[in-house]
């Protein structure tokens, strides 16, 4: 019946490996979008929400055209590790209001973990160095209030959504060059 969902298919074709990473990224993007929409419905919040501990968005005008695969994969893995930690933190620190979204946050964390494993595999297949984050992970303190955790959730999901869009676009663009 084929490999179980979590186990990567053995392949020496970088395009197939990249495809597999794109599929997981797109799938995670859809989940994130859905969860962000749920958040907006349950906890309406005007304007952009920022969290200083989140990574800055990798993509800016002009950068996509000059991307190289090692840079994209390394940056993506580092950024997604940060989002993984933030989702973990959110699940632990969330007040009662966010507990209603616990199953969805748990599923999101599991999918993030799976994508991180796939990226790690892809990097090792392509013999790329498994880069460590530029800076050690800063411990995340508890949110100041229930509203603080809601704002943090908006920021985390919004940032992850944009990061995953950057990833899909970057990876598919690179695939055309392989």
């Amino acid at each position: 019946p084929g490999p179980p969902a979590g186990s990567p298919r053995v392949s020496s074709d970088p395009r197939a490996d990249l495809d597999s990473a794109v599929l997981l990224t797109r799938s995670l993007l859809a989940d994130t979008r859905q969860l962000a929409a749920q958040m907006r419905d349950k906890f309406p919040a005007d304007g952009d929400h920022n969290l200083d501990s989140l990574p800055t968005l990798a993509m800016s005008a002009g950068t996509l055209g000059s991307l190289q695969l090692p840079g994209v994969l390394t940056r993506l893995r580092v950024d997604l590790m940060s989002y993984f930690r933030h989702v973990q933190w959110l699940r632990r620190a969330a007040g009662p209001s966010l507990k209603t979204l616990e199953p969805e946050l748990g599923a999101l964390q599991a999918r993030l973990e799976r994508l991180l494993r796939r990226l790690q595999l892809l990097m090792s297949r392509l013999a790329l160095p498994q880069a460590a984050p530029d800076q050690p992970a800063v411990p995340l303190g508890p949110p100041a209030s229930a509203w603080g955790s809601i704002r943090a959730a908006h920021a985390i999901l919004g940032g992850l959504h944009l990061t995953l869009d950057w990833a899909v676009r970057g990876l598919l663009l690179l695939k055309t060059r392989l």
Partner: antibody
Framework: EVQLVQSGAEVKKPGASVKISCKAS????????MDWVKQAPGQRLEWIGD????????IYNQKFTGRATLTVDKSASTAYMELSSLRSEDTAVYYC????????????WGQGTTVTVSS | DIVLTQSPASLALSPGERATLSCRAS??????????IHWYQQKPGQAPRLLIY???NLESGVPARFSGSGSGTDFTLTISSLEEEDFATYYC?????????FGQGTKLEIK
């Protein structure tokens, strides 16, 4: 109501440039990518490229790389497409379309801008 | 680039009849449960309108007589019972890879 309103028809000489605008309303501009599609007479629809309004990061169909430039003005919820070194084959209707992040299907379209390239 | 071929090029039917439009891709546009094919309707002088996304999902506001099916390389748009306003040109589009490409269209005409 979600709407994309494009600038009016243009007539240009070969070698010139054209810049088309697309004003978005009724939704959060940065929640979707803005894509551009060409429809030349008797030809199939052709994807030119897209831009993420949040970051201003564009990607292009290789066929249009170097001639098409996509930009956004976030504060005005407006996207722009500039096409340079125009030739007769660029005579077409150009559409902006709202693109779902990461999936490239287009659920809202502008009314189209006709560009005629003629000497 | 992936090439999409639509058939027939034109189709003449009467209101109330069932329409079946086909779209074939030069390589698979499906992967692990997702099919990256979308369908649009276009009337003369108007912009295209999204009907179906990801092969079988009906876009909000589109009548239930429209449905999409298929996987791999072969996809179908079905209109169960044609209404006067359905006579138009229909395009399929893929987003499996970059660049997204469109089919050449099927023109649905009144018999």
């Amino acid at each position: 109501e979600v709407q994309l309103v494009q600038s009016g028809a243009e007539v240009k000489k070969p070698g010139a440039s054209v810049k088309i605008s697309c004003k978005a309303s009724g939704y959060t501009f940065t929640d979707y990518n803005m894509d551009w599609v060409k429809q030349a007479p008797g030809q199939r629809l052709e994807w030119i490229g897209d831009i993420n309004p949040h970051s201003g990061g564009p990607i292009y169909n290789q066929k249009f790389t170097g001639r098409a430039t996509l930009t956004v003005d976030k504060s005005a919820s407006t996207a722009y497409m500039e096409l340079s070194s125009l030739r007769s084959e660029d005579t077409a209707v150009y559409y902006c379309a709202r693109g779902e992040l990461g999936h490239w299907y287009f659920d809202v379209w502008g009314q189209g801008t006709t560009v005629t390239v003629s000497s | 680039d992936i090439v999409l071929t639509q058939s027939p090029a034109s189709l003449a039917l009467s209101p109330g009849e069932r329409a079946t439009l086909s779209c074939r891709a030069s390589k698979s546009v499906s992967t692990s449960g997702y099919s990256y094919i979308h369908w649009y309707q276009q009337k003369p002088g108007q912009a295209p309108r999204l009907l179906i996304y990801l092969a079988s999902n009906l876009e909000s506001g589109v009548p239930a007589r429209f449905s999409g099916s298929g996987s791999g390389t072969d996809f179908t748009l079905t209109i169960s019972s044609l209404e006067e306003e359905d006579f138009a040109t229909y395009y399929c589009q893929h987003s499996r890879d970059l660049p997204p490409t469109f089919g050449q269209g099927t023109k649905l005409e009144i018999k």
